[in-house]
């Protein structure tokens, strides 16, 4: 499907056009590009308002949009293989026309990481709500749609066209119609600013009668930053109306002569420009010569001016523009310095927090302090980091190595520790014997017991012996039948899991007493070290920094 220009808004040095039509982001960008533009940027709140205005104009004319929610492509995209960067306002997305990473953003919801496919951003419009300047369209990211399959595409898109400058709309001093044709092939009869290289056709007359005259003008550059049509005096003037029609087309004052003719004039402090319609201030600061937040200060007698910058900024070589002073060059911070517009801020590496003597100082965060330890059991604080450890019978577990998981000694790498039945418990295990056998004093072997149908003998139940505190792993006991006493076949496990209160002859003993000599030690502490300061500047010089690190934000750490 094609796309029709339905609306246009020109402001500053740019025009925004809104189009309806189910196109992929690539097709939409191509459409904008054919006329010399790009999918629109939304680099500031002001620009978001301009885009909202053009969308509002489109929606007033567009009857077909019946959906409650509507989406329009803008020029914000993230290429395949480029990952989300939650620290940036644009989250790793970039503007299609190029340009810097801008501070403004208006995301609809938290973004999910996905580096495997190209992602594109659209403006999400809730059509059930009126479009208000205070409620700007939200940014929604998703797949970029596919050419030729309208079902996968969204409702429309917004283009942006940038220009050297703009001409003011032509002033009509009597009845008539102006039609502007822009370089991006849009025609309009009402633009608040008309882009450079546009044409204006003026047809004078009441409309019902024959038009008495017509004019043709082009918006051109006449001098630095002076864009004008080259028309002199108001157009379509009529003695019948004099100054009564649109103030004679004059910018400020309109003076009538006795014969129905009239002239434009200006108030004190202003002068009439070459077009004999527009007034400009005589004050040299009125043309806003200072840029970048600089204030224009009038010189003596109102003749000259100088530009003055706010604190944290300085004048550049042109003496007209303010540029940020990079306070970080003086190394005012102990660890990280972030230069900000007009100032700076100190930041601490991960694992450190602001504090200590001096401005911008950092001190180690004691991750193991009471109430904040991330570890399930043992926690050791280190400078800028920490590491977790586990008590006997547990090993470090979990994605981040902060949890402790019970070691199942009954299926351990050294083979079964019990001669017959083995019961795993939290942090320990017990050995047991089949009916007719009793546990030997060593707690591991089984010996033939007296034939009895009464309750089996054995040491008292020591279920909780060796149980560690602080474990987050749920308590469970499992029985694993192992080999029987020498010369007897292996026992077959029973279908009902023995519980510690069952009639099975069981016992428990502290782990250290149960480890048979020569068997591998059960006490293991891999001590995963948390390199939480990995984002700080501690990469070894010349080292390979391509290793992906797991970030706390759930991303895979690839930059």
């Amino acid at each position: 499907t094609g796309a029709d220009t339905e609306a246009v808004v020109c402001v500053g040095t740019a025009c925004y056009t809104a189009h309806s039509g189910k196109l992929s982001a690539a097709e939409a960008q191509n459409h904008c590009n054919q006329n010399g533009g790009n999918l629109a940027t939304v680099k500031s709140k002001e620009e978001a308002q301009h885009v909202q205005r053009v969308l509002a104009q489109l929606l007033r004319r567009e009857a077909a949009l019946t959906a409650r929610m509507s989406k329009f492509w803008i020029g914000l995209q993230r290429e395949k293989g480029k990952c989300l960067d939650p620290s940036l306002p644009l989250k790793g997305f970039s503007w299609v026309g190029g340009g810097e990473d801008t501070p403004y953003s208006n995301w609809h919801k938290e973004l999910r990481n996905s580096c495997i496919s190209k992602r594109c951003v659209s403006l999400l419009l809730d059509l059930s709500q009126p479009l208000l300047p205070s409620r700007l369209p939200k940014w929604s990211e998703g797949p970029c749609g596919s050419p030729g399959s309208p079902g996968s595409n969204i409702e429309g898109f917004v283009c942006k066209f940038s220009f050297k400058g703009m001409c003011r709309p032509l002033a009509l001093g009597g009845p008539g119609q102006v039609t502007y044709t822009t370089p991006f092939q849009t025609t309009s009869s009402s633009l608040e600013a008309v882009p450079f290289a546009s044409a204006a056709n003026v047809a004078c007359g009441e409309g019902d009668k024959d038009e008495t005259q017509s004019h043709y003008f082009l918006c051109k550059e006449k001098a630095p930053d002076v864009f004008d049509w080259g028309s002199s005096g108001p157009l379509c003037v009529s003695p019948k109306y004099g100054c009564n029609f649109n103030n004679g087309g004059c910018h400020q004052d309109c003076f009538e002569g006795g014969d129905g003719s009239f002239l434009c004039g200006c108030r004190p402090g202003f002068r009439l420009l070459d077009d004999l319609v527009t007034c400009a201030s005589r004050n040299p600061c009125s043309s806003s010569p200072c840029r970048g937040g600089a204030t224009c200060v009038l010189g003596p007698h109102g003749k000259n001016y100088t530009c003055r910058c706010p604190q944290g900024y300085q004048l550049d070589s042109s003496q007209l523009d303010c540029v940020d002073v990079d306070e970080c060059q003086d190394s005012p911070c102990a660890q990280e310095c972030v230069n900000t517009p007009g100032g700076f801020r100190c930041e601490c590496w991960v694992g450190y927090e602001p504090g200590g003597p001096g401005e911008g100082a950092c001190q180690d965060v004691d991750e193991c302090a009471l109430g904040r330890s991330p570890c399930a059991q043992g926690c050791t604080n280190t400078d800028g980091s920490f590491h977790c450890s586990c008590e006997e019978g547990y090993v470090l577990a979990g994605e981040d190595g902060t949890q402790c998981q019970d070691v199942d000694e009954c299926v351990g790498p050294g083979g079964p520790l019990c001669d017959s039945l083995c019961f795993n418990t939290q942090g320990s295990f017990h050995c047991g014997c089949l009916p007719g056998w009793v546990l030997a004093p060593n707690g591991v072997s089984c010996t033939m017991g007296p034939v009895s149908l009464g309750p089996p003998s054995g040491p008292p139940d020591e279920e909780d012996k060796g149980e560690k505190e602080g474990s987050t792993v749920p308590r469970a006991a499992t029985a694993s039948p192992t080999r029987g006493p020498e010369g007897t076949p292996k026992a077959t496990p029973t279908t009902s899991r023995p519980s510690l209160s069952s009639d099975a002859p069981i016992t428990s003993a502290p782990l250290k007493m149960l480890a048979p000599s020569g068997s591998p030690g059960v006490w293991r502490e891999p001590s995963i070290h948390h390199a939480t300061a990995a984002s700080g500047p501690q990469e070894p010089a010349g080292g390979d920094s391509s290793v992906a690190t797991q970030n706390n934000d759930g991303t895979d750490g690839q930059k």
Epitope: L218, K220, E221, G230, L320
Partner: antibody
């Protein structure tokens, strides 16, 4: 390539008028300012004024208003300058010069070869 | 109107050495956009003027990089790093900040 071809030399009597031409080729004639510059023998350059052929918009240096009239014919891609009430002060070489980019006012990278106007009784 | 001032003659230069030509304006040609609207043209004997430098320091198309322009808002210099015989002629500075556009009186490059 861009070319500006000016009309040949003119010998005119004082008080008369003369109209010299500058034909543009190799570009979109309507969308570029055409400037006119005067150079008296052994002297410097003076900007007379300019015309935008697309809509006939003109600008003049105040001292040439009433002396020079600039016009353009889009159909023949030709710009004209008429000089009236000629005196010996008007004896000079007159150059046409086109701007560098469409719709822009500066600079003048393309010049005609010049037309010598001699005012003599 | 803005008046552009130039010396009538340069200091005589030897071929292969550098030369500098100066120009000054009665008003700063630095616009609020940061652009300085100062231009240099060379008129060789019997020829039309040729654009050398535009907007104070930009080299025009086809001009050898021996030519360079610099300056402040009101004082400007055209520098030729290695003068060649074909560089002989009159050098004009011009301003296009305000209408009427005005030219300097021209500086003739003298060869020793």
């Amino acid at each position: 390539q861009v070319q500006l071809q000016q009309s040949g030399p003119e010998l005119v009597k004082p008080g008369a008028s003369v109209k010299i031409s500058c034909k543009g080729s190799g570009y979109a004639f309507s969308t570029y300012w055409m400037n006119w510059v005067k150079q008296r023998p052994g002297k410097g350059l003076e900007w007379i004024g300019r015309i935008f052929p697309g809509d006939g918009d003109t600008d003049y240096d105040g001292k040439f208003k009433g002396k020079a009239t600039l016009t353009a014919d889009k159909s023949s891609n030709t710009a004209y300058m008429q000089l009236s009430s000629l005196t010996s002060e008007d004896s000079a070489v007159y150059f046409c010069a086109r701007t560098g980019a469409a719709y822009e006012f500066d600079p003048f990278p393309y010049w005609g070869q010049g037309t010598l106007v001699t005012v003599s009784a | 109107d803005i008046v552009m001032t130039q010396a009538a003659f340069s200091n005589p230069v030897t071929l292969g050495t550098s030369a500098s030509i100066s120009c000054s304006s009665t008003k700063s040609l630095l616009h609020s956009s940061g652009i300085t609207y100062l231009y240099w043209y060379l008129q060789r004997p019997g020829q039309s003027p040729q654009l050398l430098i535009y907007r104070m320091s930009n080299l025009a198309s086809g001009v050898p990089d021996r030519f360079s322009g610099s300056g402040s808002g009101t004082d400007f210099t055209l520098r030729i790093s290695r003068v060649e015989a074909e560089d002989v002629g009159v050098y004009y500075c011009a301003q296009m900040l305000e209408r009427p556009f005005t030219f300097g009186s021209g500086t003739k490059l003298e060869i020793k």
